[in-house]
Each structure stands twice: as structure tokens, then as C-alpha cells.
């Protein structure tokens, strides 16, 4: 906290310019109004302020807003983004997708901070949903964001927004996360031709069910084995040995070297020998 | 609700093989989703998987101990069955038997018992 | 073979303490890994499966996440029941190994 203390003559701040990196913390709490730093805000982030200088700064907003920064604020915030904890970024109504593009651009670079997952948070809780510009958004910065949210939270991604996912995005969602995707991605990609549906289909069939596999099988989808360790050991396992052969067409030979691998492992284990024969890879049930 | 029980000497001769069943009650050892494991604790160490048997009779074993064990099921008696071969006091411990389905992992264990290697 | 080390070896904590247990696999097991509770004189008990689904009947302040190499168990606010050794265990590759436990122990 610092101290209040009357403002210097000559030295009261008519703007927000380079002057001010001269003055001391004190200085800047009594010389500098709150009034004038909120709509000058895009100014500061062009003006190498310390960190010391950067927390007065944010004093002086917390003082002008103590139920939390307005969105015109909140959007050229800038590097003072950085000194916001969660609890001051749980007081503010983000609403718009250019004022969160904005504050990512600040954390760029980075793992998701404590910060950023609270703002997206609010910013997804005012939207109500995970709509498809979001996701867009999201995922552009953050690859993993999508894995990191609980089924309960994807459950609230409209199929609409399945689009914007690309396979990177789901590299480390879990069966659970899947099971809510994939339904979703079913719906969203239910109107287009065989090839081009496996295709965008591919990454979410983790969480995809026996009877859906078994329908591919029937499409000469060439499955490559990446993709077929990511099912689901449950829905793995009552494929007969033909089904696999046509689910993965000239990618068989790959299960050979996954033979000690789950859903293999699993799959080979409950084939009768002579079936698992038929594919002469030498696998033993 | 299956419940598992080990059985066996506790007592056994270095050099000499290691014998012990585990009897499945309340469900059969005959289905189709579950593995059936032999596992060990040493005393005061951590756990150690020496292999499982699918009803089939299909069987794997933990590469370090693979050339000394055997693990067999009889489906007619609902039980399992390990044997380890050439013991040593190294291979004194607290022997679990335990299902694994293969959609979760170890759910059900029996309470274990304890093997001492000693002349 | 797949090696699990599991961190910290032992560690004391308070009833109501958030607990964070760590388990690194020497290679990618996926999302292929198991965590167990044992108490002394017991047999170990399943309490989180697949990396982060929970166990029928076990309680909600367990948690696991994680995958590839890196995995979690979480214990949101430790209750006097849950001071035990907690295992970790990747089933993915068939050498099915278990980590070397951690010990949480009474402050």
C-alpha cells in the first residue's frame, strides 16, 4: 500500500506519457488521476513502467473500481493483465471475444496461467456456451484447452463449435472427455460423404462405441494403428478378427507391434487362435 | 459379489517350488471382460505383478520372473493357480491374487498370504 | 518395460490438506494408469482407473489426471481414512509395473 501523500507542484499528470516512468511509486499514487489512467489504458502498455510502478497503477484502478474494472478497461489492460490475480479477474464481465484475444495475446507464449484460466472461465460462463469463435480462439492459443476441461464443462460445447477442432487439440483429452466429444462431433459431421467423414471424425473416436466401429469396418476407412490404440478397450473388444482386418485394411500388420500394448493386448487375448491365424502376423491369443 | 482366497503353504524350502490357489466365489473365472494376476509385497516394500491367466488357459508373466513361473486356471474348480520355482528368501513376501477387468484395473484382491523362504 | 517412479517417497499432511501425489512413466503409457490405496496389513484397493476415472464407491475427493508420462493423484482434503501408502500402475504394456509408493503419514 502506498503511503497518500499531496502531489508535488508542477508535477500533477495531464496524460499518460514517458514522463511518468521518472516518477517515484509515490508520486505516481498522488500525481497520477484514476479517472485519466481508465481511458488512457492503451497507452500504458507503450511505456516501459517497473513492476513496482505497474502495481501503483493497479492500486490506483482497484481504488476507482473496487466491484472490478469495466470492459473498457479490462481490454487495453495489457501487461498489467500480469499483476491481476484470480480473485480480481472473478469481479469482471468479459463479454467480448476481441477483449479476451487481447489479454491472451499478453500471457502468449505461456502455459495457461492461474489468471488466464479464470478469465476464460468467466468469459465462458457469460457466454453460456463454448461456441465456435471461442473454441477457435481458445485452441489457437491454447492447443490443450479443450482436454483441460471436465466433461461436465463439454458438455456445454454446442456441436456447431466441433468444427473448429483440429486433432492437435485433442491429443490429451482421456476416454471420459471423448465419450462427451464424440457424440457431438457424430452430429456435427453426420451429413457428409463416407471418405471426407472419417476424415474429421477420425480424432474424436475414442470415445466411439462398437456399433459405430462396426459400421466403419464396412467402409474401407483404412484406419491407421495411432488411431486405433486411442479406442476404447469396451468397444475394442468385441470386434471379431475380420472386423479389425476391414477397419484397418492395409494398416493390420501394424497390430504386431502393438501386441503388448492396451486395447491390443486385450482384443488379441479373447480371439480364437484360429481366427487371430487367418491374419498371419503370428499373434498368440 | 466375487470375493478371491489364496491358499497355500507358508512355509517353503529354498531351492523348492512355490505353490499356492486362489478360489473365486460369487462369480466365475470363466468371464469374458476379466484377467486373474498373482501379486506379491515383499515385507515393508511396494507391490510387485508376477502375471495373470485369461480363462482361455492364455497367460503373461512379469519378464523378470518369467522363467520361474507358472500360472494355470481350473475352470471346473474356479480357481487359479501360480507355482514359482527355484525360491530363494528373495522371494519372501505377502502373495495377492486379484481380478482385473479389463475395462478399470485391480478391483478385487484377495487378503494375501504371507510366504516365508527359509530352510 | 515401462518404469514408474512415483514422487515423493512419503510425506506428512494435516486432516483438511490438499495432497498431490506424482507419478512419471519412463515412456508414453497413454492415459493407462491406475492408483491404489493400501493400509497396513491390507490389500490394496482401486481408487482411480484410466487416469482420471473414479472407482465405484470410492470417495470424490480423489482425483486423477494426467497422460502420456506425466500422472496425478489428487486428494482434495485428506480425511483422517486416508493416511496409507498410494500406488500408481501403468496396464498398457503387458509388463504391467507398479510404482514405488508414497506414504502419507500424519503431521
Known amino acids: 500500500e502506498v503511503e497518500k501523500t499531496a502531489c508535488p507542484s508542477g508535477k500533477k499528470a495531464r496524460e499518460i506519457d514517458e514522463s511518468l516512468i521518472f516518477y517515484k511509486k509515490w508520486e505516481l499514487e498522488a500525481c497520477v488521476d484514476a479517472a485519466l489512467l481508465a481511458t488512457q489504458m492503451d497507452r500504458v502498455n507503450a511505456i516501459p513502467f517497473t513492476y513496482e510502478q505497474l502495481d501503483v497503477l493497479k492500486h490506483k484502478l482497484d481504488e476507482l473500481y473496487p466491484q472490478g474494472y469495466p470492459e473498457s478497461v479490462i481490454q487495453h489492460l495489457g501487461y498489467l493483465f500480469l499483476k491481476m490475480s484470480p480473485e480480481d479477474i472473478r469481479k469482471w464481465n468479459v463479454t467480448s471475444l476481441e477483449t479476451l484475444k487481447a489479454l491472451l495475446e499478453v500471457n502468449k507464449g505461456h502455459e495457461m496461467s492461474p489468471q488466464v484460466a479464470t478469465l476464460i472461465d468467466r468469459f465462458v460462463k457469460g457466454r453460456g456456451q463454448l461456441d465456435k469463435d471461442t473454441l477457435d480462439t481458445l485452441t489457437a492459443f491454447y492447443p490443450g484447452y479443450l482436454c483441460s476441461l471436465s466433461p461436465e464443462e463439454l458438455s456445454s460445447v454446442p456441436p456447431s463449435s466441433i468444427w473448429a477442432v483440429r486433432p492437435q487439440d485433442l491429443d490429451t483429452c482421456d476416454p471420459r472427455q471423448l465419450d462427451v466429444l464424440y457424440p457431438k462431433a457424430r452430429l456435427a459431421f453426420q451429413n457428409m460423404n463416407g471418405s471426407e467423414y472419417f476424415v474429421k471424425i477420425q480424432s474424436f473416436l475414442g470415445g466411439a462405441p462398437t456399433e459405430d466401429l462396426k459400421a466403419l469396418s464396412q467402409q474401407n476407412v483404412s484406419m491407421d494403428l495411432a488411431t486405433f490404440m486411442k479406442l476404447r478397450t469396451d468397444a475394442v473388444l468385441p470386434l471379431t478378427v475380420a472386423e479389425v482386418q476391414k477397419l484397418l485394411g492395409p494398416h493390420v500388420e501394424g497390430l504386431k507391434a502393438e501386441e503388448r500394448h492396451r486395447p491390443v493386448r486385450d482384443w488379441i487375448l479373447r480371439q480364437r487362435q484360429d481366427d487371430l491365424d487367418t491374419l498371419g502376423l503370428g499373434l498368440q491369443g | 459379489q466375487v470375493q478371491l482366497q489364496e491358499s497355500g503353504p507358508g512355509l517353503v524350502k529354498p531351492s523348492e517350488t512355490l505353490s499356492l490357489t486362489c478360489t473365486v466365489s460369487?462369480?466365475?473365472?470363466?468371464?469374458?471382460?476379466?484377467?486373474w494376476s498373482w501379486i506379491r509385497q515383499p515385507p515393508g516394500k511396494g507391490l510387485e505383478w508376477i502375471g495373470y491367466?485369461?480363462?482361455?488357459?492364455?497367460?503373461n508373466y512379469n519378464p523378470s520372473l518369467k522363467s520361474r513361473v507358472t500360472i494355470s486356471v481350473d475352470t471346473s474348480k474356479n480357481q487359479f493357480s501360480l507355482k514359482l520355482s527355484s525360491v530363494t528368501a528373495a522371494d519372501t513376501a505377502v502373495y495377492y491374487c486379484?481380478?482385473?477387468?479389463?475395462?478399470?484395473?485391480?478391483?478385487?484382491w484377495g487378503q494375501g498370504t504371507m510366504v516365508t523362504v527359509s530352510s | 518395460d515401462i518404469q514408474m517412479t512415483q514422487s515423493p517417497s512419503s510425506l506428512s499432511a494435516s486432516v483438511g490438506d490438499r495432497v498431490t501425489i506424482t507419478c512419471r512413466a519412463s515412456?508414453?503409457?497413454?492415459?493407462?494408469v491406475n492408483w491404489y490405496q493400501q493400509k497396513p496389513g491390507k490389500a490394496p484397493k482401486l481408487l482411480i482407473y484410466a487416469a482420471s476415472s473414479l472407482q465405484s464407491g470410492v470417495p470424490s475427493r480423489f482425483s486423477g489426471s494426467g497422460s502420456g508420462t506425466d500422472f496425478t493423484l489428487t486428494i482434495s482434503s485428506l480425511q483422517p481414512e486416508d493416511f496409507a501408502t498410494y500406488y500408481c500402475?501403468?496396464?498398457?504394456?503387458?509388463?504391467?509395473?507398479f510404482g514405488g509408493g508414497t506414504k502419507v503419514e500424519i503431521k
Open positions: 500402475q501403468q496396464p498398457y504394456d503387458a509388463s504391467y509395473t
Open positions: 486379484a481380478r482385473e477387468d479389463a475395462l478399470t484395473g485391480f478391483d478385487i
Open positions: 460369487g462369480g466365475s473365472v470363466s468371464s469374458y471382460h476379466d484377467l
Open positions: 515412456q508414453s503409457s497413454r492415459y493407462y
Open positions: 491367466i485369461y480363462y482361455s488357459g492364455s497367460t
